[in-house]
């Protein structure tokens, strides 16, 4: 008799998930000498242990603590770039500006980027058919809890001036319900962080509006200021030119507003 399986609203575990995590771990530790001591098999075992045989709506941050411990990594605390709804450009930026780091430039963020995973209660199986959707099913699912955990730790580690890249094309440039708005903003430490600088990325070529005056940016400014962290904001009118100028800062066209 085929065993009844819970149907969730979200897509199932990414195919070849164990192999992907292990391969990413090996690749990352080869590229980053400071992480060469990491045992990737142990990392996978800890990752797996966080969700296998557990109800996928009952995952806690504690479940991920063994993985967090193995993935402990020191990034320069004053070189952190947060982002919200504009991941690709943020990653393009840190690929050029090698001394700055997004969460996905760390081992744990790199391992899980764009992947989905979940298990089933009381079985050692990975569920490749479906996984809980954050809205439709439950928020305490393996993927959401993972990102909440690593995002909190990443924000807590930040110091001095922290940058955040925001998508100016969205109706809510700053969204209180995003990971940035609900987790990272509230875990920046006022004792260590002096300023949060927002970069609002414009979408349209002819868009000359000052999006730093957007009501949602004002909301972010107020939230951050009340954490006793100063706030500043810059419009990035031409993201293509912005990246080009990061690559070639001597270019004469890079002195004007980007």
């Amino acid at each position: 008799v085929p065993r009844w399986r819970q149907q969730w609203s979200g897509p199932g575990t990414t195919k070849r998930f164990p192999e992907t995590v292990l391969a990413r771990c090996v690749k990352y530790t080869e590229i980053h000498p400071e992480m060469r001591h990491v045992d990737c098999q142990s990392v996978w075992d800890a990752f797996k242990g966080a969700f296998i045989s557990k109800h996928p709506c009952n995952i806690t941050e504690e479940d991920y603590q063994p993985l967090m411990k193995l993935g402990t990594q020191t990034v320069p605390c004053n070189k952190i770039l947060l982002w919200s709804r504009i991941k690709d450009l943020a990653h393009q930026f840190t690929q050029v500006q090698r001394d700055m780091f997004t969460l996905e430039d760390t081992l744990l963020g790199y391992l899980a980027d764009d992947l989905t995973w979940c298990g089933e209660f009381n079985t050692s199986k990975i569920n490749y058919q479906s996984c809980p959707d954050w809205r439709k099913d439950c928020s305490n699912n393996p993927v959401s809890v993972f990102w909440k955990t690593v995002s909190r730790r990443f924000a807590e580690a930040a110091c001095d001036v922290v940058h955040v890249m925001l998508n100016g094309s969205r109706s809510k440039i700053f969204d209180k319900n995003s990971t940035f708005g609900s987790v990272e903003v509230h875990n920046l430490q006022p004792e260590k962080v002096q300023t949060l600088e927002a970069w609002v990325i414009h979408g349209g070529r002819e868009d000359s509006r000052d999006l730093c005056q957007d009501p949602t940016i004002k909301e972010l400014e107020s939230i951050i200021s009340k954490r006793n962290i100063q706030f500043s904001c810059k419009n990035i009118y031409r993201p293509d030119k912005f990246l080009q100028c990061v690559k070639n800062p001597e270019d004469s066209s890079c002195t004007s507003e980007i």
Epitope: H186, P190, E191, Q194, C212, E221, S222, S225, K226, R227, N228, I229, Q230, F231, S232, C233
Partner: antibody, heavy 115, light 111 residues
Framework: SVEESGGRLVTPGTPLTLTCTAS????????VTWVRQAPGKGLEWIGI?????TTYYATWAKGRFTISKSATTVDLRIASPTTEDTATYFC?????????????WGPGTLVTVSS | AAVLTQTPSPVSAAVGGTVTIKCQSS????????LSWYQQKPGQPPKLLIY???TLASGVPSRFSGSGSGTQFTLTISSVQSDDAATYYC???????????FGGGTEVVVK
């Protein structure tokens, strides 16, 4: 240091602008709060101006006061003073770091509203 | 609007003794810790003592300490000195800036 100026005797209804000036640093790069204290009374939080120029006011102060900034100063305008506005007015800067925390205060400027 | 109630006032203390001043807010301050304490002497502007509920401001003697979170906060002065005679104010910051307010003040008399 910071210093307030512009305090004087005015008649009720006469608009008055107080100015906060800094020496040794630029006020435009810091959060600035205005506070007042009536003779023999406690402190009252009036409002704050952010680095960006965004302003927020205490509920009781909305519509009665306006905070604005230039490159070097921060102003507090009292639109239509009444005798209840008689007080020493302080500006306080969140310098060198911070926002609503007030480590740097001016000596205050006295405003007297009387007919 | 938020109401910050300071107790007691006035409070009397002997040199070398300990003074405790309470500040109770009618609603929770931002992040449960955005409350600061100020000391004011006659004819002078206020002086920052404690911020974010428990962080000692630069140059402030360690006999001053702050504690509490949410709606209940305490300023403690241990080994009181005659120079500590002053009025002490708490300042609460709230989600709605319209609610931001100082407490009514607590006068400390040193005998």
């Amino acid at each position: 240091s910071v210093e307030e100026s512009g305090g004087r005797l005015v008649t009720p209804g006469t608009p008055l602008t107080l100015t906060c000036t800094a020496s040794g640093f630029s006020l435009s790069r810091y959060y600035v709060t205005w506070v007042r204290q009536a003779p023999g009374k406690g402190l009252e939080w009036i409002g704050i101006i952010y680095i960006s120029g965004t302003t927020y006011y205490a509920t009781w102060a909305k519509g009665r006061f306006t905070i604005s900034k230039s490159a070097t100063t921060v102003d507090l305008r009292i639109a239509s003073p009444t005798t209840e506005d008689t007080a020493t007015y302080f500006c306080a800067a969140a310098w060198p770091v911070g926002t609503y925390v007030l480590p740097l205060w001016g000596p205050g400027t006295l405003v007297t509203v009387s007919s | 609007a938020a109401v910050l109630t300071q107790t007691p006032s006035p409070v009397s203390a002997a040199v070398g003794g300990t003074v405790t001043i309470k500040c109770q807010s009618s609603q929770s301050v931002v992040n449960a810790n955005n409350l600061s304490w100020y000391q004011q002497k006659p004819g002078q502007p206020p002086k920052l003592l404690i911020y974010l509920a428990s962080t000692l401001a630069s140059g402030v003697p360690s006999r001053f300490s702050g504690s509490g979170s949410g709606t209940q906060f305490t300023l403690t002065i241990s080994s009181v000195q005659s120079d500590d005679a002053a009025t002490y104010y708490c300042l609460g910051v709230y989600d709605d800036d319209g609610d931001n307010a100082f407490g009514g003040g607590t006068e400390v008399v040193v005998k």
